[in-house]
Structures are given as C-alpha cells and as structure tokens.
Amino acid sequence: IWELKKDVYVVELDWYPDAPGEMVVLTCDTPEEDGITWTLDQSSEVLGSGKTLTIQVKEFGDAGQYTCHKGGEVLSHSLLLLHKKEDGIWSTDILKDQKEPKNKTFLRCEAKNYSGRFTCWWLTTISTDLTFSVKSSRGSSDPQGVTCGAATLSAERVRGDNKEYEYSVECQEDSACPAAEESLPIEVMVDAVHKLKYENYTSSFFIRDIIKPDPPKNLQLKPLKNSRQVEVSWEYPDTWSTPHSYFSLTFCVQVQGKSKREKKDRVFTDKTSATVICRKNASISVRAQDRYYSSSWSEWASVPCS
Amino acid sequence: RAVPGGSSPAWTQCQQLSQKLCTLAWSAHPLVGHMDLREEGDEETTNDVPHIQCGDGCDPQGLRDNSQFCLQRIHQGLIFYEKLLGSDIFTGEPSLLPDSPVGQLHASLLGLSQLLQPEGHHWETQQIPSLSPSQPWQRLLLRFKILRSLQAFVAVAARVFAHGAATLSP
C-alpha cells in the first residue's frame, strides 16, 4: 500500500481467482483513543471499533472511503483504491491502446518546436468518475523539472456504437535548451483513477523524436507568363523555433489531381518556393519536416490550382 | 580548414559535409518500425559519448560570441563516432552489406573532423573492453544505438554549420 495523495491510498493486488489479497491497517487521524467506530462509503454499518481497523482487501467491494467517527462526528477519511496486477502485468483498462507508432501506446506526445513545450494526449471510452494527474521530468535518476498543466477533455468522437473521449495535457520543460543534443529522455507519468480503480501510464521520449511542425503558412501561387508552370511560395510556421538559419526545415511540395488515383508529382526542397506544373482541378500541397532530423512531417497546407 | 582554436572555419564546406552526414546517418539506420532502443538501458556501451550540451556554446548566441568552444565539442564527437564506426562493432559479424552507407558515413566523419582539427589541443579515443560485445545480436543492437545517437549529434552539428554559413561567414 502506498499514498497517492493526502488520505488516498493505493492497494496493489495480484488479481486472480481466490487470491489472498492484501492486509491493510487503517489508523484514525485523531488524538482520541476511545469510542471510535469505522464505516465504509455511505453505509452506516459499523465495520469495527478502535483507533485502527484491519481489513483484508481482495476486491473492489473492499475498496472505497473508510471513515472513522466518534459520537456522530467524522474524525478522518482514508480512500482506498485498487491497482490490479494480472499475470505480472499491471492493468490498462482505463485508457485505449492507440497502437501508433507501436502496440501498447497509451500516451502520445508531440512538440511543435524545440522550446521544451509539448502536448500529450490519450483516449478512453469512459465518460464519468474519471480523474487524471500528470507528472513529468527530464531523466529519472537525477530528474530535472518539467511543469505540466491539468489534463482536460479535448475532443469527443463517435466510434461505431461507442463514444471516445480524448484528454490532453500541455507540459513545459523548466530550463529548456533548444540547441542542445538531448541525452536524457523526458519521462511522462499519468495517474488515472476510474471510480476505485487506479492505473498508471508512462511514456519516455526525446523532444527531437516527437517534433511535428505546424503546416507551412501563407501558401501562395504565382502563375509564370506563357507557361503552365506556377511558382509556389510559403513561409515557415509561426510556431517553429527561431532563428530559421539554425532551426531549418525542409519541404515537400505535391501536386494532386481531383481523383486520389491520379499520379502525384512530388518535389523536395529546402527553399520556401518551388516551380511546379499546375494541372486543371488539381491542388498544390506543402508540408514541412526538420531539415536535419527525420521526425514527423507536418500536416499539409493546400491551395487549389485554379 | 575550420580550426577551433583561432581562425574562422570554412563554414560552407562544413555545412555541406554535415548535411551529407545527416542524410547518411538516416540512410544507415532509418526508423525501423520505431525500435525503442532506450529500453535496453544506458549501460557502459554508449555512455562516454560527447553530447552537445547546453553550456557548449552551440546555440546561435554562443556561436556569435565565440564559435570555437562549440567547434571543439563537435570535433570531439566526430572523432569519437569515427572511431566507433571503424571498430569491430561495425567491422565484425554480422557483416554489413556491400552497399551499406556506413563506410561513406565513416569517411565523411573523418573528413569533417579533419576540417575541424583544433589548434592547441588534441583529443583521442580509446577502445574500452565493454565496447566490444561478443554476440552478433549484441553487436547489431549496439550498431542501432550508436547510429541513433549519431543522428542526434550530427543534426545539432548541421544546424551549427548552417547557421554559421548563413550568419558568420566572412
């Protein structure tokens, strides 16, 4: 058993049929010695008396808010949550496996630049009685500070018969060094509580590996005289790290016909302009990637050819 | 020559070679199914790598103030990786494919390190016993780890030379 926060405790249980469970001793936080009784949740049934209460925690029916009273007055509470371990593996019932970029990916994180700011998100089908708490650090043995905000519900989607809820959190490294080569990964830890079930999820990454620039901005076409060619120009996204002479991007320019089956013409360039042939009813799209490190491409910025 | 001891480096030459290094490092080890090599733990095999850290003067302001400190650090890393790529980690079994970019990568590391030969002091690397795994599968894993680490290192070096070529060239 360990303390998650004040008056909230997590009992770690090996979860299999007829498991013996865990013996837990609760102590009433009071100077009083006599006339103390214990109850669980909203029930008025007295579970025991005395300053301590010993219980055998085996299942969710044994978890909940234990309260000690004296003469109708509440003295203190202890909330017991369960963390299930099945076949040596901690349960992951609360969050959905996003399966990208690999199986057992529950947390996904992205950064728009090298400032040390990043966003993580996760999915669940649970809509109520759900709380999240997020902690992060750079490295684990001698951790350096990363400050995370509160997790918030950022999107709701309907998937077949189910509703899916996306939660996200923003974090900022306290003493970020954008130009340095990271040698210690960022660690992100999410505590999830659904009713009386506790689970924790972790992710470990370098900022460089989760970079995904915003799409290029101000995408414009300039027709060239007496030609089917056009000059496409764009700018670095505002959110990208500066100076651009140091934090450089490379770009992919694509000409795509109306039909998805039509052949795509692609040009790669380090410049912020390119000359392409604009076909009727086609569109021109540009996306960006770090020039020197192959992290994710941005989403496409697009304009119609006409 | 780009000398991290006094005179100004050949920024444009260094920029071209460092950008080539980035391309080679990624073609030598593309992201194969997102292998998470950090899960293997950071044992003694790769932990004496000269990382470009915050105080090394490789940020735009540090380069403007005095680029020599950063160039010395980059030089350290280049000779470290050059030694690793020439060691039995890469020359031993399993043999690299004949068209593997590792040979080119090794030569380019050497080329850039010679461009950056520092004045005033000299760095060398020593092969440490723990850097020579006996099993081919260990060697393969170590190659991946070294190449992933090299990708991060040359990315910073390339940014430094690109910025230098754009803003610090005479």
Epitope: - | N47, D48, P50, H51, Q53, F69, Q72, W123, T125, I128
Partner: nanobody, 125 residues
C-alpha cells in the same frame, strides 16, 4: 559537493618525471569528466589534459602531448597525471578539476565546477 586534493608535485630536473594524483571526496567522480589545468606566474590558467568518465576519450594540450598521460581509477575516486620528459616551461601550479555537467569533459576551464587547491611543480634546468 566534491572536494579535490592534488598531491605529487615538487622540484625536479629537466628531463625528469613526476606523477600527480587527485583524490576526490564528498562525491563519487565515476560519472564525470575530469581535467588537469596549470597556471604559471602571471599567466592564465591553461588546459593540460582531460579524461572522460569511462576513459574512452582523452584530450591533451599540444604542449604536453606525447610526454604527459592522464588516467583514472574510478574505484579509488582518483585521477592521475604522469609527467615525463619535463621541461622548465612546465613549471606551474597544477590543478585538478571535475566537470560535473559532462561525462566527456571540454578543454574550457569555466565549464569545470570542482577545483582542487593545486600542487606546485618546479622544473629546473
């Protein structure tokens, strides 16, 4: 905080040898780069040699390369500087220093955190 104590200095004739030791206490140095620097009267402190945490990387100033050898024994929390073929221009106070931010140290004295009190080396002609 790391405390460093140098020893082994003294008066020696040109062409002679000395072995300097630097014993660290208060913190294990096995994860940090270590360096030797020297300062002659009226001159700036200058880099002599440095060694990485696991001895994989070693640096020497051009003026001592081939004559001096830096080494370390992490089990003993000690760094050594073997000085051979000493010259009068090697006369200086020799300082040991720890780069507590790096496994692979630099040649920049300002990057080193822990410094010893120094040991005097005098080479007579």
């Amino acid at each position: 905080e790391v405390q460093l104590v140098e020893s082994g200095g003294g008066l020696v004739q040109a062409g002679g040898s000395l072995r300097l030791s630097c014993a660290a206490s208060g913190r294990t140095i096995s994860n940090y780069g270590m360096g030797w620097f020297r300062q002659a009267p009226g001159k700036e402190r200058e880099f002599v040699a440095a060694i990485s945490a696991r001895s994989a990387m070693i640096g020497y100033s051009d003026s001592v390369k081939g004559r001096f050898t830096i080494s370390r024994d992490n089990a003993k929390n000690t760094v050594y500087l073997q000085m051979n073929s000493l010259k009068p221009e090697d006369t200086a106070v020799y300082y040991c220093a720890a780069d507590l931010n790096r496994r692979v140290p630099t040649a920049r004295p300002q990057e080193y955190d822990g410094w010893g009190q120094g040991t005097q080396v005098t080479v007579s002609s």
